[in-house]
Interface confidence: low
């Protein structure tokens, strides 16, 4: 039957469709195609006569139709006015008709839509916002994200005008959140930018910190109060009823007993209109005077200073205490205490060494501490380190390396390659390297305050083919079902795949086995003897690849349990005895004897010439491996019957 | 992030002069090289001149000795190009490259500026 498919059904504006005519029959005359779902000669597109190759525009042939031989109708640059049907019209050689009719839709390519909103500072648990998707279109979907996400489930959220426009009711500061709508229909989809919706609230109920409410007298009182409120609250301070000051920070300093009272935090959000304030009650008590520290070395050196650390001021009668890091002084032959406590010398400081240090003042009711003191040992450089840690490069990157020592003060840092001074900088930078820029880069580090410098020198290599690699080993002789190995391929490069290969296959699917460091690692966990394979690993980038040679893991294994050959326990007087003895095992194990428990030699083959039945027994072969500490043994019956006898018969009487 | 950005080229007529600027950031000329390479249409790219400010030394190709200068003034991270004497084959885009401290390989380049000699 003859059939019209339209390619494709939903047209966008300005494409292009596809008429396409399925079984058309033999022996034409001709064709017409129609706009509309019928024959009607004023909505003739076009006429086509096969016998003269002749196609003939009608009263609807706008000049954007393509008519094929085989029947099939091409319409290009698409309008709004071309949806609906299409009639063919076959006329057959026997001058017999035949009809059929096909469709499609044309729709607009969607402009970008924008998000207008009717409330641009809504005011929460108050106000509801409309968002509105721009422009109006017909025939188009409308959805909306929030945060990319679709939108949650909310009895405070409401979809109106065919989804145009999304209400949000008593909007919450949760609701400070990025929009967009997106419109669709069956030709395009387009997405807004986002509008951020800026919910104005609060200001809640402020909280005042410290939350002690105790101070003693010569202390600082420092308050801070902070409300949760969109736009920031505006605070102000009260003591005692009366207005202090308009700051979110409330300082008096060496405060009094006559500092006493109620300090009230009042946060103001002058958007929203709203008050909060939260009220606070402060004692201070008269107290001794507070300790300080003082100290004899206030930049010692590393390994090389003693510091005296001393409790001021000096009082009679008075206990005084230390604390390291906030604990008790630790016991150690490098803290020495005066015999008044007053003095904590601390012997040849190290780094671990700054503190900080508090000493305190015992009196009747507490402790006074002093304030924390931290001490600023100089020390380093220790050895610097170079990062990243890549010894290979491809040519036209940048180079960028970055040195690192431990030091106080900090170290300055110079650069050098092959021996040449290149910048005092801790980073150095080459941009779009060459094969040229291969060499020995040796980072220095200074100290200035010790004067002590340190080195370190990193091979670079810089080459377009990347270097045969090699593989490394934290373990040349693993211990089979006990160790694991860890094989790694050198060097570490950059923008680099690694790829192992085990007897020449790519790895095989195992728990035992596992990959790590981007591929560079691959390690054998619980190693057995079959694991003694050649290992190879690649190396390859956009340009080159290279193997390296096989590495054959080593693994100790054994030693099994041995086995006695031949097998016969049988034999005839006059006979002579060889017994050789077996065991799987690497390294070769040693091998020992006992005939009836009596030690005999270590070979591996015990040899007695022309037996007899004194020689009847047990014989035991015992097998040890030095190397994975391991012993085995096997125990075989031997009987010898004298000459004339069969083996295994008893003799008759 | 390393930038080098040209100014100072135009329209001048044979005989005349212009002086070409060269602004970096993202690193200090005075650790490095830097040169001017010109590209005209159907020619080699040519390095015309180059400076490395860390041991003062400068180079200049035979087609532009005694007609062009190369300087750099490290305090303003900028290097100079002063052309006297123009000439019609000296028409091109100019480009500032970082030339590098160990071998001299212009290979990092700005966007260019056009320098066009024509009466």
């Known amino acids: 039957k003859l059939t019209i498919e339209s390619t494709p059904f939903n047209v966008a504006e300005g494409k292009e469709v596809l008429l396409l005519v399925h079984n058309l029959p033999q022996h034409l005359f001709g064709y017409s195609w129609y706009k509309g779902e019928r024959v009607d000669g004023n909505r003739q597109i076009i006429g086509y006569v096969i016998g003269t190759q002749q196609a003939t525009p009608g009263p609807a042939y706008s000049g954007r139709e393509i008519i094929y031989p085989n029947a099939s109708l091409l319409i290009q640059n698409i309008i709004q006015n071309d949806t609906g049907f299409y009639t063919l019209h076959v006329i057959k050689s026997d001058l017999v008709n035949e009809e059929a009719t096909g469709q499609f839709r044309v729709y607009p390519e969607l402009p970008k839509p924008s998000i207008s909103s009717n409330n641009s500072k809504p005011v929460e648990d108050k106000d509801a916002v409309a968002f509105t998707c721009e422009p109006e279109t017909q025939d188009a979907t409308y959805l909306w994200w929030v945060n990319n996400q679709s939108l949650p489930v909310s009895p405070r959220l409401q979809l109106s005008n065919g989804n145009r426009t999304l209400t949000l009711f008593n909007v919450t500061r949760n609701d400070t959140a990025s929009y967009k709508c997106e419109t669709q229909n069956p030709v395009s989809a387009r997405r807004s930018d986002s509008v951020i919706l800026n919910v104005l609230y609060g200001p809640d109920a402020p909280t005042i910190s410290p939350l002690n409410t105790s101070y003693r007298s010569g202390e600082n009182l420092n308050l801070s109060c902070h409300a949760a409120s969109n736009p920031p609250a505006q605070y102000s301070w009260f003591v005692n009823g009366t207005f202090q000051q308009s700051t979110q920070e409330l300082f008096i300093p060496n405060i009094t007993v006559n500092n006493s009272g109620s300090y009230t935090c009042q946060a103001h959000n002058s958007d929203t209109g709203l008050n909060r304030t939260t009220v606070t009650t402060i004692t201070v008590y008269a107290e001794p005077p507070k300790p300080f520290i003082t100290s004899n070395n206030s930049n010692p050196v590393e390994d090389e200073d003693a510091v005296a650390l001393t409790c001021e001021p000096e009082i009679q009668n008075t206990t005084y205490l230390w604390w390291v890091n906030n604990q008790s002084l630790p016991v150690s032959p490098r803290l020495q205490l005066s015999n008044d406590n007053r003095t904590l010398t601390l012997l040849s400081v190290t780094r671990n060494d700054v503190g900080p240090y508090e000493c305190g003042i015992q009196n009747e009711l507490s402790v006074d501490h002093s304030d924390p003191v931290i001490l600023n040992v100089l020390y380093g450089p220790d050895d610097p380190t170079i990062s990243p840690s890549y010894t290979y490069y491809r040519p036209g990157v940048n180079l960028s390396l970055s040195c690192h020592a431990a030091s106080n003060p900090p170290a300055q840092y110079s650069w050098l390659i092959d021996g040449n001074i290149q910048q005092h900088t801790q980073e150095l930078f080459i941009s779009n390297i060459t094969e040229k820029n291969s060499g020995l880069y040796t980072c220095q580090a200074n100290n200035s305050a010790s004067g002590h410098s340190r080195t370190t020198v990193k091979t670079i290599t810089v080459s377009a083919e990347l270097p045969k690699p090699s593989i490394s080993s934290n373990n040349s002789k693993p211990v089979e079902d006990k160790d694991a190995v860890a094989f790694t391929c050198e060097p570490e490069a950059q923008n680099t795949t690694y790829l192992w290969w085990v007897n020449g296959q790519s790895l095989p699917v195992s728990p035992r086995l596992q990959l790590s460091n981007g591929n560079r690692t691959l390690t054998l966990f619980n190693v057995t003897r079959n694991d003694a394979r050649a290992y190879v690993c690649g190396i390859q980038n956009s340009v080159s690849a290279n193997r390296s040679d096989p590495v054959t893991l080593d693994v100790l294994y054994g030693p099994d349990t041995p086995i006695i050959s031949p097998p016969d326990s049988s034999y005839l007087s006059g006979a002579n005895l060889n017994l050789s003895c077996h065991s799987a095992s690497n390294p070769s194990p040693q091998y020992s004897w006992r005939i009836n428990g009596i030690p005999q030699q270590h070979t591996q083959v015990l040899f007695i010439a022309k037996i007899t039945p004194n020689n009847n027994g047990t014989y035991a072969c015992f097998v040890s491996n030095l190397a994975t500490g391991r012993n085995n043994s096997i125990v075989k019956s031997i009987t010898v019957s004298a000459s004339g006898t069969s083996p295994g018969l008893s003799a008759g009487a | 992030e390393v930038q080098l950005v040209e100014s100072g080229g135009g329209l001048v007529q044979p005989g005349g002069s212009l002086r070409l600027s060269c602004a970096a950031s993202?690193?200090?000329?005075?650790?490095?090289?830097i040169g001017w390479v010109r590209r005209a249409p159907g020619k080699e790219e040519e390095l015309v001149a180059d400076?490395?400010?860390?041991?003062?030394?400068?180079r200049y190709a035979d087609s532009v000795k005694g007609r062009f200068t190369i300087s750099a003034d490290t305090s303003k991270n900028t290097a100079y190009l002063q052309m006297n004497s123009l000439r019609a084959e000296d028409t091109a885009v100019y480009y500032c490259?970082?030339?590098?401290?160990?071998?001299?390989?212009?290979?990092?380049w700005g966007q260019g500026t056009t320098v066009t000699v024509s009466s």
């Open positions: 490259a970082i030339v590098s401290a160990r071998d001299g390989y212009y290979n990092y």
């Open positions: 400076i490395c400010p860390y041991k003062g030394s400068t």
């Open positions: 993202g690193f200090n000329i005075k650790d490095t090289c």
